[in-house]
Amino acid sequence: AITEAREEAKPYPLFPGPFPGSLQTDHTPLLSLPHASGYQPALMFSPTQPGRPHTGNVAIPQVTSVESKPLPPLAFKHTVGHIILSEHKGVKFNCSISVPNIYQDTTISWWKDGKELLGAHHAITQFYPDDEVTAIIASFSITSVQRSDNGSYICKMKINNEEIVSDPIYIEVQGLPHFTKQPESMNVTRNTAFNLTCQAVGPPEPVNIFWVQNSSRVNEQPEKSPSVLTVPGLTEMAVFSCEAHNDKGLTVSKGVQINIKAIPSPPTEVSIRNSTAHSILISWVPGFDGYSPFRNCSIQVKEADPLSNGSVMIFNTSALPHLYQIKQLQALANYSIGVSCMNEIGWSAVSPWILASTTEGAPSVAPLNVTVFLNESSDNVDIRWMKPPTKQQDGELVGYRISHVWQSAGISKELLEEVGQNGSRARISVQVHNATCTVRIAAVTRGGVGPFSDPVKIFIPAHGWVDYAPSSTPAPGNADPVLII
């Protein structure tokens, strides 16, 4: 039968009875071998029945005495089988065996759950020699037990290549419940049920769980560990914890905050990183995400011109990297820009609107209605045009660039003229007779040169011809205008 000792019981005497060989209580050990020094606790569990050897693993010596009497089987004496104690208490337990003096070099090793205990454990072996036998007591002490000390301890002794093994001593360290799973913080949808889990273990078992929400107990009736709490939904943030109770007392888990997902706060600090004639690069600082990751953002762009129709352009983009290049804008224009971002719950309000302007650009269209005619009397080519629409000038006109290409008998020569912005006509000298002159005109702003107009061709005859009609930019759909004389 297993003997059980509880911490409430009186400590057993260190050595309650005589061994064979009539070990007297006033004997002092001949040799004491500490395996590791350490505090020896007051609470000790020692053999309760040192008499009968157990029937477990025994070694039967082959050697006989002078009288040829066989020696009795060697075995560890029975000791306490089960020790129950509280965490942080001290404990001492031992194995004892009587070994005939004919054996030398007997050593006792301690094992826990099948593994030898080496190193800094508080193990001491004491030898009590007598005429025929030596009583050996191997003591093992733990100054402050922890849960990890739970287990089955045995002694082993090697004699004549035989191994003698003691009965196990079961150490059960009891304490307050220990959490193996605690509730975790979560972000949840408003008024939607969710689960929290709490698990704690002893010993001692059972462990009962109580849930606490915002310092109010959820279940007045305990649930056995593990416990899953279904929270029926929240309308505002709440703090949850669980209490684990056993016979030793209670342990309270960490409190976890459960947040309610909401629409995000509007972005802040919308700023202009860079402006060009037709694009604006903006950045923003995201607002609070409402406990739900941002999905995407929307950039809203309005013309700031009071005469505009007030329509809003919307550009959608990913939430990262809080940067967006707004394209397809007009040059030299003012815009109001706002940013809104969304999570799974919905869209934030729009950020404070900021004003931004595009820079001057090169004109986006060419001058219109280009006409070319030959003024033979002055040997010039007269060019006339209409300036591009103001909206499409993309800036303030500073002038025009005229390209005229002269082609004759396999020779081609291009010349460029710059003219001021005032007026819409120019005159260029005839460069080559009996040749074709091809004219194109582009508007120029400080932002650059715009596109050239479609080419207008005029034939310059040899000297002596009369009467010339003008050549002009064709109506849409016609290609390569040529003046027929």
Epitope: N191, N208, W211, Q213, N214, S216, V218, N219, E220, Q221, P222, L229, T230, P232, G233, T235, A238
Partner: antibody, heavy 118, light 106 residues
């Protein structure tokens, strides 16, 4: 299905005692608390307290401490309400109700009318 | 203890109409539960934890609110809905009931 069946009506004289029973079926009796609720004639509902069916420990609200005793016989899944030294103002319908998380009374007995009259 | 005040004390409506019953707590509560009681019968759980429909309760019943103000709404009254309705708070012991709202046929 979950059922709470209460004992029948009682007519008692002032100073006497009465014991009302509430037998539960259709669920594990010791997994849920058992509450008692009083409703005086023409009045609203008053929570009297509850008994922990796991530990047997009763809890009484302030107005029901003293003459009121909650008890259990878990072997027959039955809860009891005993009222001693009955007074005329104890005349009411007494309900037992299963008591679950968040203080929800999800199943109710049919009620027991206790009349105290000389 | 938390006092629950239900209003109105009596509400007279016709079948098919919408009913809105109010329950106000003297201080913040965690959840509100609602019960229906018909004459000679035990109360029956309708809504638990403010907005959750109890088993077997028709979807025309709904609950809302938070903090101290809670509402039970019956979207379209049926003849069997005329009864007394009680709110009950969770969040502070002792749990308390409101005085009830009697919903009667106009």
């Amino acid at each position: 299905q979950v059922q709470l069946v209460q004992s029948g009506s009682e007519l008692k004289k002032p100073g006497a005692s009465v014991k009302v029973s509430c037998k539960a079926s259709g669920y594990i009796f010791t997994s849920y608390g058992l509450s008692w609720v009083r409703q005086a004639p023409g009045q609203g509902l008053e929570w009297m307290g509850w008994v922990n069916t796991y530990s047997g420990v009763p809890t009484y609200t302030d107005d029901f401490k003293g003459r009121f005793v909650f008890s259990l016989d878990t072997s027959v899944s039955t809860a009891y309400l005993q009222i001693s030294s009955l007074k005329a103002e104890d005349t009411a319908v007494y309900y037992c109700a299963r008591y679950t998380n968040y203080g929800v009374f999800d199943y109710w007995g049919q009620g027991t009318l206790v009349t105290v009259s000389s | 203890e938390i006092v629950l005040t239900q209003s109105p004390a009596t509400l007279s409506l016709s079948p098919g109409e919408r009913a809105t019953l109010s329950c106000r707590a003297s201080s913040t509560v965690g959840y509100m539960h609602w019960y229906q009681q018909k004459p000679g019968q035990a109360p029956r759980l309708l809504i638990y934890a403010t907005s959750n429909l109890a088993s077997g309760i028709p979807a025309r019943f709904s609950g809302s609110g938070s903090g101290t103000d809670f509402t039970l709404t019956i979207s379209r009254l049926e003849p069997e809905d005329f009864a007394v309705y009680y709110c009950q708070q969770w969040g502070s012991l002792p749990f308390t009931f409101g005085g009830g709202t009697k919903l009667e046929i106009k």
